[in-house]
Structures are given as C-alpha cells and as structure tokens.
C-alpha cells in the first residue's frame, strides 16, 4: 500500500495508472467502499461521499491511462485509505493529512514563547523537526516549543513532518517584534547635538502603540521619564516631554530622538519601551550617553567623561605631534602645567578611538 502525506488546506493528487494507455472505466472509493468519483462514458461522475465537492480528476490524462484523484482544501479527516478500481485491479493509497499551526499570533514579542501544534490523523505517530531562520533545530512530537524567542528567530521556519519514511514540509512565517539592537551607546563631546535612533527589527502594515524613554542620569539620584509618545499608523506624536532636557522627536519611523546638546548632567543610560496595541508586553532598547569635557583651569588641563563606560576603556591626554601623553583607565585624566599646543583628549577601547576632543593650550608668559 502506497502512503501519501498531505498538508491541511493544500491540494493532493493520488495517482492511479492503467496498464493500457487508453481511456477506460475507473472508480475511486474510500475505505467504507463509498464511491467518490469515476468515469461513465466520457464524463466524470461523483458519488455520495463527503469529498464530492473537493474531488476532481485530470480528464486530459485519461487517454494516457492516468486516472488520478485530486483532493482540494485538504482536511485532517480526509486521512483514509483510498481505493482506485481500474482494469479489474485495485490500487490502495493511504492518505495522511497533517496540519501545523502556531498556537498564538505569529507576531510575537522578543522573549515570548512560540508553540507549534501538529494536527494529525488518529493512529499516526509522526515526528516533527523544525529549523529556525537562524539555523536552530528543534524536535518534537505533537507540540514544539521555543521558550524564548530571539531577534534572529524572525523569518520563515521550516518544519518537516515524518511518518512511515515519508515527509511533508511546512513553512511558517514568524515575526519577532523587537528593536534591531538591544543596546547602543552614543559618545559625544560636551555641547554637541545628540541623536538617538531606535530602529525596529520588523515591519508591520499598521503600527500603533505608545512609548516612553526613562532616563537615569549618572549624577541624579533617581530616574525620570524624559519623553512619552504616541505611535499611530507609523506616525509619531509627542504626548509629554521634560522641560530639561527638551528632547525633540521625529514624526516618522524609525523612532528618532534629538537632544539639543550633550551635557555632563545628561550622561547616563535610558530605557526606551514601546507598547504595541493588542500585544501583551513591551519592546525594550537600552541607550547610553557618554559625554566628554576637556577644560583648562589655571595650571591644570583636565579631561573628564561622564556616563556608563566600561573599566577597560582608556582616557588619554596627548599633545599633538609630541610624545607627551598621560593615560588612565579612569573617568578623568589631567596634566599639571601643560606645554603650549593642541592637546587631544581621547577615549579609546583597545586602541579604537570612541571619542575625541581637542583643546588649545596657549603659552603663559
């Protein structure tokens, strides 16, 4: 007996061939011997089965001795043994129809769980193997669970259902709702304009919700909400913004915030959250601001940074075109009685300069 696997909602073709390549009488019946379709004269006739409105045959192939039965919009309950009667012989085909669906919406927030459920005919014992767009392999039986979705899980999941050494492949599109980056750091000299960008890792036809940026300044004892905004069909409008700093926000996606100037009192870290309409939970992106200031006061040249810096970052003061350098893995460096000339303050990570500020020291007569 031949086994054919089908997918719920799809179309399947069960083949039946006569030895003689000519038009001849044939019938398709189910396991209960109820006629589904057949030929009478030159016409296709249908029996009283439940499949009658979804079953068909390729008339163009009859004269080649091919008497297939096509079943459209497959249902799990179509799983059965079908019998083709042609030329006084019977050919049996076992059809097994499977369905694989996501238990919830296929648009899920990062960190949420995804459950795929297999619908299968009674008596079958299939196995399922799924591969994520990022190459993650997951195996299971009737259900497959991905406990915590990551950004890279967004895309088409390919799942293979196996039964009796036959396979059928399902493709499920999963959209993980997240920001492109979990965290980002902006390095600025004091007084420079600061641009924060929060690009999304997905696109939706209709994007509505609300967002808020909470900020913990390094110098402040508590965090506060810097801005609250509305997102309606990808249009952004500010609901509430602090007086200091007076942030500005772009009206279109990607979410974009501008801080007029970087000041030491603003250095710190923020958390932008976005709540999407009809979704439980929020999207998060952390953003950090590091501010550098180079100053000369009397005989002291100082370079300072504020904000979240890692201990391995190096802060240096260096006289241009000269070897004079002072470096520290600290948030402030200074030189007493500096030589005249252009001094550079550099914040670097393993030799890579993250932030640079120049200050001119004039000779004192």
């Amino acid at each position: 007996k031949k086994v054919v696997l089908g997918k719920k909602g799809d179309t399947v073709e069960l083949t039946c061939n006569a030895s003689q390549k000519k038009n001849t009488q044939f019938h398709w019946k189910n396991s209960n011997q109820i006629k589904i379709l057949g030929i009478q004269g030159l016409f296709l006739t249908k029996g009283p089965s439940k499949l009658s409105d979804r079953a068909d045959s390729r008339k163009s192939l009859w004269d080649q001795g091919c008497f297939s039965m096509i079943i459209k919009n497959l249902k799990i309950e179509d799983s059965d043994t079908y019998i083709c009667e042609v030329e006084n012989k019977k050919e049996e085909v076992e059809l097994l129809v499977f369905g694989l669906t996501a238990n919830s919406d296929t648009h899920l927030l990062e960190g949420q769980s995804l459950t795929l459920t297999l619908e299968s005919p009674p008596g079958s014992s299939p196995s399922v193997k799924c591969r994520s767009p990022g190459g993650k392999n997951i195996q299971g039986g009737r259900t497959i669970s991905v406990p915590q979705l990551e950004r890279q899980d967004s895309g088409t999941w390919t799942c293979t259902v196996s039964q009796d050494q036959k396979t059928v492949e399902f493709k499920i599109d999963i959209v993980v709702l997240a920001f492109q980056k979990a965290s980002s750091t902006v390095y600025k000299k004091e007084g420079e304009q600061v641009e924060f960008s929060f690009p999304l890792a997905f696109t939706l036809e209709k994007l509505t919700g609300s967002g808020e940026l909470w900020w913990q300044a390094e110098r402040a004892s508590s965090s506060k909400s810097w801005i609250t905004f509305d997102l309606k069909n990808k249009e952004v409008s500010v609901k509430r913004v602090t007086q200091d700093p007076k942030l500005q926000m772009g009206k279109k996606l990607p979410l974009h915030l501008t801080l007029p100037q970087a000041l030491p009192q603003y250095a710190g870290s923020g958390n932008l959250t976005l709540a999407l309409e009809a979704k439980t939970g929020k999207l998060h992106q952390e953003v950090n601001l590091v501010v550098m200031r180079a100053t000369q006061f009397q005989e002291n040249l100082t370079c300072e940074v504020w904000g979240p810096t890692s201990p391995k970052l190096t802060l240096s003061l260096k006289l241009e075109n000269k070897g004079a350098t002072v470096s520290k893995q600290a948030k402030a460096v200074w030189v007493l009685n500096p030589e005249a000339g252009m001094w550079q303050c550099l914040l670097s990570d393993s030799g890579q300069v993250l932030l640079e500020s120049n200050i001119k020291v004039v000779p004192t007569w």
């Epitope: 509505t208 919700g209 609300s210 967002g211 808020e212 909470w214 004892s221 508590s222 965090s223 506060k224 909400s225 609250t228 509305d230 309606k232 609901k239 509430r240 602090t242 007086q243 200091d244 959250t273 709540a275 309409e277 009809a278």
Partner: antibody, heavy 119, light 107 residues
Framework: EVQLVESGGGLVQPGGSLRLSCAAS????????MSWVRQAPGKGLEWVAN????????YYVDSVKGRFTISRDNAKNSLFLQMNSLRAEDTAVYYC????????????WGQGALVTVSS | DIQMTQSPSSVSASVGDRVTITCRAS??????LAWYQQKPGKAPKFLIS???SLQSGVPSRFSGSGSGTDFTLTISSLQPEDFATYYC?????????FGQGTKVEIK
C-alpha cells in the same frame, strides 16, 4: 509598597483657603508626575491638576485656574494643593494620585481628604 | 475639552454574568484610555491603561478593547467583589476627563 496619604481637609467658608498635602512613600517620588482628582458627594470623578517631576510644568482644569496651585517638594516626598477663593462647588473628596506607565494612567491613589465649603 | 460618555449608567447583573461597559470619546484619543473601579467610600483602583493593557494583579476576567473613540470594558464572569462603579478616563489631552461612571449592581 506604594502609599499616598492626603491631609489638610476640613470645613471652610466660601472665599476661604485651604492647603492639602499628600505624603508619598514606597516609590521614587521625584521620578513621577502627580495629579489631584476630586469627587463631589454622590458624583463622578473630576481631574483637577497635575505637576511634572521637577515641579516646573503644571496643568489645571478650567474651573480651578487662577484659584488653585499645585506644587511639590521632592526632598520631602510631598505634593500640595493650595486652594484659594473656595466655592460651594469645590466641596469634594480630593485624591492625590501617581501617574505611572507610558499610557499616563493614575496607577496609585490616596484614600482622599474631604473638603467642605459651606457657610 | 474631550467629553467621555459611558453607557449604561447602571447595570444589574448576577454572579457569573458577562458585563460590558462602553465608553465613547467626543474626539479620537487613540488608545489613551484608562479604566478604574471604585467601591463606596474607597479610592478608585486602576484596572486598565492603553485601552487594553491590564494592570498587574488585576484578574484576567477584566479586559479592555477599542481605539479612537469607542472603548469597551468587559467582565467575563462577574464575581461578588466586582460590584462597584467603573470609570473610564482619557489621557490624550488636557484637561484629562472621566466618564460619568457605570454602577454594576446585584440583580
């Protein structure tokens, strides 16, 4: 545990003044906008005023503009409502409430202070 | 000012009933709507923000829906402790305004 406790309510004659206080605890008071909401006896809720974290941005309902002043003292975790030129229609239970979450809802409320304006 | 209109003003229901309260804004407020529950002599209690986001600790029998001008609060299976007055409130623009309230009474 977030707690808001109002005080300063009482009986006052029309045209008189009263100052309500709200003592906050269990959260970082200086991080949140705060509101006053009132409820006349047997009536619904009416939002009165709110103030931002730093105390430099304030909004009022038209019926109290020029008569009521909202203020705060972050060092003392306290919110205030100075009510002048009081009228009989200002009689109500006054609630202090915290504004929390990005949808600007009033997520925690005090138990209320009754203000009665009557001669 | 944005007017908020709740209906019905009161509803009589039994334990286990499904109760639906509607709130209509005089102009579009996107999802800037909150729902509160108030029992006699007590302060209001926050239930839902953003039209549909349930406050943590609020039973899942409460749900909110809607956007723009029309909003709904649904109690899927009324419990004895749910008999109270419910208010909607818009936070779209100042002054913030509340609906007149819907009293859920025991039938």
């Amino acid at each position: 545990e977030v707690q808001l406790v109002e005080s300063g309510g009482g009986l006052v004659q029309p045209g008189g003044s009263l100052r309500l206080s709200c003592a906050a605890s269990g959260f970082t008071f200086s991080s949140y906008w705060m509101s006053w909401v009132r409820q006349a006896p047997g009536k619904g809720l009416e939002w009165v005023a709110n103030i931002n974290q730093d105390g430099n941005e304030k909004y009022y309902v038209d019926s109290v503009k020029g008569r009521f002043t909202i203020s705060r003292d972050n060092a003392k975790n306290s919110l205030f409502l100075q009510m002048n030129s009081l009228r009989a229609e200002d009689t109500a239970v006054y609630y202090c409430a915290r504004e929390g979450g990005q949808w600007l809802a009033l997520d925690y409320w005090g138990q209320g202070a009754l203000v009665t304006v009557s001669s | 000012d944005i007017q908020m209109t709740q209906s019905p003003s009161s509803v009589s229901a039994s334990v286990g009933d499904r109760v639906t309260i509607t709130c209509r804004a005089s102009q579009g407020i996107s999802s800037w709507l909150a729902w509160y529950q108030q029992k006699p002599g007590k302060a209001p209690k926050f239930l839902i923000s953003g039209a549909s986001s349930l406050q943590s600790g609020v039973p899942s029998r409460f749900s909110g829906s809607g956007s723009g001008t029309d909003f709904t609060l649904t109690i899927s299976s009324l419990q004895p402790e749910d008999f109270a007055t419910y208010y909607c409130q818009q936070a779209n623009s100042f002054p913030w305004t509340f609906g007149q309230g819907t009293k859920v009474e025991i039938k």
